[in-house]
Interface confidence: low
């Protein structure tokens, strides 16, 4: 349905608060280096203009597209050329090229300082002095660091952020109340950003068919009682929502997400028995709750899949008539029966089934050819099962930090060309799979672990695409979305890699090491570990363990010394010499 004024339509649908929040997020995700005040000014101007259009939809410029209005506004930034360089060239283009140009310049790894958390009293004073500015600052800082953050979900995070300050700034012990809440929001926010980045990568790199397949599998696991037609409708709507958000069409995205939540709550009976408690909540919380809702119970009377997909003589006829629908139904039927499988495994099984039909439906006796298709699934199922089992055993044996180190060594040997900060970030996150998933019951381990690993490896792919250095990484990232994790798992030591020359500077440490937090100390040590492996890719576990133990002892000794800097200056070269000898 068309509207005379798109901006008035969205303003009325979303309300002023959400409208302003989403425009701020959109601008911050496009112009990631602009100061906060500049963005607030632009948002206020857009909002005032939107209000004139609400009053009179025929007013001048009210008929313009949102891309035109927002792009014109962004292009008024005076320092565009100096701050963004070639991105300023976008402003010479017409829509839709201009918006596409802005999208292309989104930076997944912007050169922004890490966010420093001020003292609790300082934050509470800022919150009380100007709550609105405080919350806008939160949206701005998160959005510019995470240019693909799911915008309507970021509004939900901001609401929780506000609630935390409103509650804790009145508490007797403000810090004890607030800090755990902020830590939780930070960790959940990073996870949410990474999950959304995979959705956008899926859409942008592999097309909406890939995203829809993912959504069919996931929603069929969540809603096993829903009919295929119902799941298909939800998938279509969800694809539209995420396509819009990934395109930077945040107002449309938030509006459509609200419509989807409304639809789901009005049709609970045909979707899931688990939606009830979500549907009593206010909009932002409701949408979040629906997205995170637990899997409904499987219907008790589900027949065997073999009848329709293996035993039937009409398999090829049904497949030929409507390939995607037939494969979609297969995926739906398989997924609703297997909440214990990862989505990526389910997609691999659907792909294997499709390949079998492609081959067999051309054969003289198709049925004979595809009769054993389910047997071919066994190795595909066992591979992630074994991987989860082995890695959970290793995690339980080593603990998180040493498990991360094992992964650091493993991945540095696989792809030593990748930058050290990227290897450290990705391996640390891969290592978190242990604490996240290994404590779960058997039936939940694989979906937790493999689908989490897909999200983390997507981060590696996104960073690597910006600065490609390894053909192996490019191959694993681009050949198949569903096979990314198995592709990385299968990589061996890179025999072609020329070891990095030893650089003593890399292993020179100072007294500032002693004042670092435990996490920062770990990152320093893990950075050194990656550099060691890059220097000696064929070093054994025992050799590396010996060097890392010596390193920990050396740092501990110097941090206890009276003159810490002198100790580092004296003991550092000894540690370097001993390490070189140990790895010789």
């Amino acid at each position: 349905d068309t509207h005379k004024s798109e901006v008035a339509h969205r303003f009325k649908d979303l309300g002023e608060e959400h409208f302003k929040g989403l425009v701020l997020v959109a601008f911050s995700q496009y112009l990631q280096q602009c100061p906060f005040e500049e963005h607030v000014k632009l948002v206020n101007e857009v909002t005032e203009f939107a209000k004139t259009c609400v009053a009179d939809e025929s007013a001048e410029n009210c008929d313009k597209s949102l891309h035109t209005l927002f792009g014109d506004k962004l292009c008024t930034v005076a320092t565009l050329r100096e701050t963004y360089g070639e991105m300023a060239d976008c402003c010479a283009k017409q829509e839709p090229e201009r918006n596409e140009c802005f999208l292309q310049h989104k930076d997944d790894n912007p050169n922004l300082p890490p966010l420093v958390r001020p003292e609790v009293d300082v934050m509470c004073t800022a919150f009380h002095d100007n709550e609105a500015t405080f919350l806008k600052k939160y949206l701005y800082e998160v959005a510019r660091r995470h240019p693909y953050f799911y915008a309507p979900e970021l509004l939900f995070f901001a609401a929780r952020y506000k609630a935390a300050f409103a509650e804790c700034c009145q508490a007797a012990d403000k810090a004890a109340c607030l800090l755990p809440k902020l830590d939780e929001l930070r960790d959940e926010g990073k996870a949410s950003s990474a999950k959304q980045r995979l959705k956008c990568a899926s859409l942008q790199k592999f097309g909406d068919r890939a995203f829809k397949a993912w959504a069919v599998a996931r929603l069929s696991q969540k809603f096993p009682k829903a009919e295929f037609a119902e799941v298909s409708k939800l998938v279509t709507d969800l694809t539209k929502v995420h396509t819009e958000c990934c395109h930077g069409d945040l107002l449309e995205c938030a509006d459509d997400r609200a419509d989807l939540a409304k639809y789901m709550c009005e049709n609970q009976d045909s979707i899931s028995s688990k939606l009830k408690e979500c549907c009593d909540k206010p909009l932002l919380e409701k949408s979040h709750c629906l997205a995170e809702v637990e899997n409904d119970e499987m219907p008790a009377d589900l027949p065997s899949l073999a009848a329709d997909y293996v035993e039937s003589k009409d398999v090829c006829k049904n497949y030929a008539e409507a390939k995607d629908v037939f494969l979609g139904m297969f995926l739906y039927e398989y997924a609703r029966r297997h909440p214990d499988y990862s989505v990526m495994l389910l997609l691999r099984l659907a792909k294997a089934y499709e390949a079998t039909l492609e081959k067999c439906c051309a054969a003289a006796d198709p049925h004979e050819c595809y009769a054993k298709v389910f047997d071919e699934f066994q190795p595909l199922v066992e591979e992630p099962q074994n991987l989860v089992k082995q890695n959970c055993e290793l995690f339980e044996q080593l603990g998180e930090y040493k498990f991360q180190n094992a992964l650091l060594v493993r991945y540095t040997k696989k792809v030593p060309q990748v930058s050290t900060p990227t290897l450290v970030e990705v391996s640390r996150n891969l290592g978190k799979v242990g604490a996240k998933c290994c404590k779960l019951p058997e039936a939940k381990r694989m979906p937790c672990a493999e689908d989490y690993l897909s999200v983390v490896l997507n981060r590696l792919c996104v960073l690597h695409e910006k600065t490609p250095v390894s053909e192996k990484v490019t191959k694993c990232c681009t050949e198949s979305l569903v096979n990314r994790r198995p592709c990385f798992s299968a990589l061996e030591l890179d025999e072609a890699y020329v070891p990095k020359a030893f650089n003593a500077e890399t292993f020179t440490f100072h007294a500032d090491m002693c004042t670092l937090s435990e996490k920062e100390k770990q990152v320093k040590k893990q950075t050194a570990l990656v550099e060691l492996v890059k220097h000696k890719p064929k070093a054994t576990k025992e050799q590396l363990k010996g060097v890392m133990d010596n390193f920990a002892a050396f740092v501990e000794k110097c941090c206890k010394a009276d003159d810490k800097e002198a100790c580092f200056a004296e003991e550092g070269p000894k540690f370097v010499a001993a390490s070189q000898a140990a790895l010789a």
Partner: nanobody, 116 residues
Framework: QVQLVESGGGLVQPGGSLRLSCAAS????????MSWVRQAPGKGFEWVSS????????RYADSVKGRFTISRDNARNTLYLQMNSLKPEDTAVYYC?????????SGQGTQVTVSS
């Protein structure tokens, strides 16, 4: 909404050439990989070729390798397929699609007929 409009098809003799175009609108063309797929009479869809969003990485089905060239002009929101040394078995409706290999077409397609 997303629109893909294919053009440039026609009747050509074996060994001849054609250049197909696909005008895209309603989405961030520059941010997406694109593909060409084709459907021969009475057959299913067959992937032909893919190109990444920046145009630096191209892939081809074995059946067209060395004869077809995929390219794009992001400034014009247009995808191209240059087809040389055409054979009768290249006769099909050709569609462009958002995404890499396996992407599903959403346009009307353009008919290519190779016949003497």
């Amino acid at each position: 909404q997303v629109q893909l409009v294919e053009s440039g098809g026609g009747l050509v003799q074996p060994g001849g050439s054609l250049r197909l175009s696909c005008a895209a609108s309603g989405f961030a063309f520059r941010g997406f990989g694109m593909s060409w797929v084709r459907q021969a009479p009475g057959k299913g869809f067959e992937w032909v070729s893919s190109i990444n969003n920046g145009g630096s990485d191209t892939r081809y089905a074995d059946s067209v390798k060395g004869r077809f060239t995929i390219s794009r002009d992001n400034a014009r929101n247009t995808l191209y397929l240059q087809m040389n040394s055409l054979k009768p078995e290249d006769t099909a409706v050709y569609y462009c699609a958002i995404g890499g290999p396996g992407a599903s077409p959403s346009g009307q397609g353009t008919q290519v007929t190779v016949s003497s």
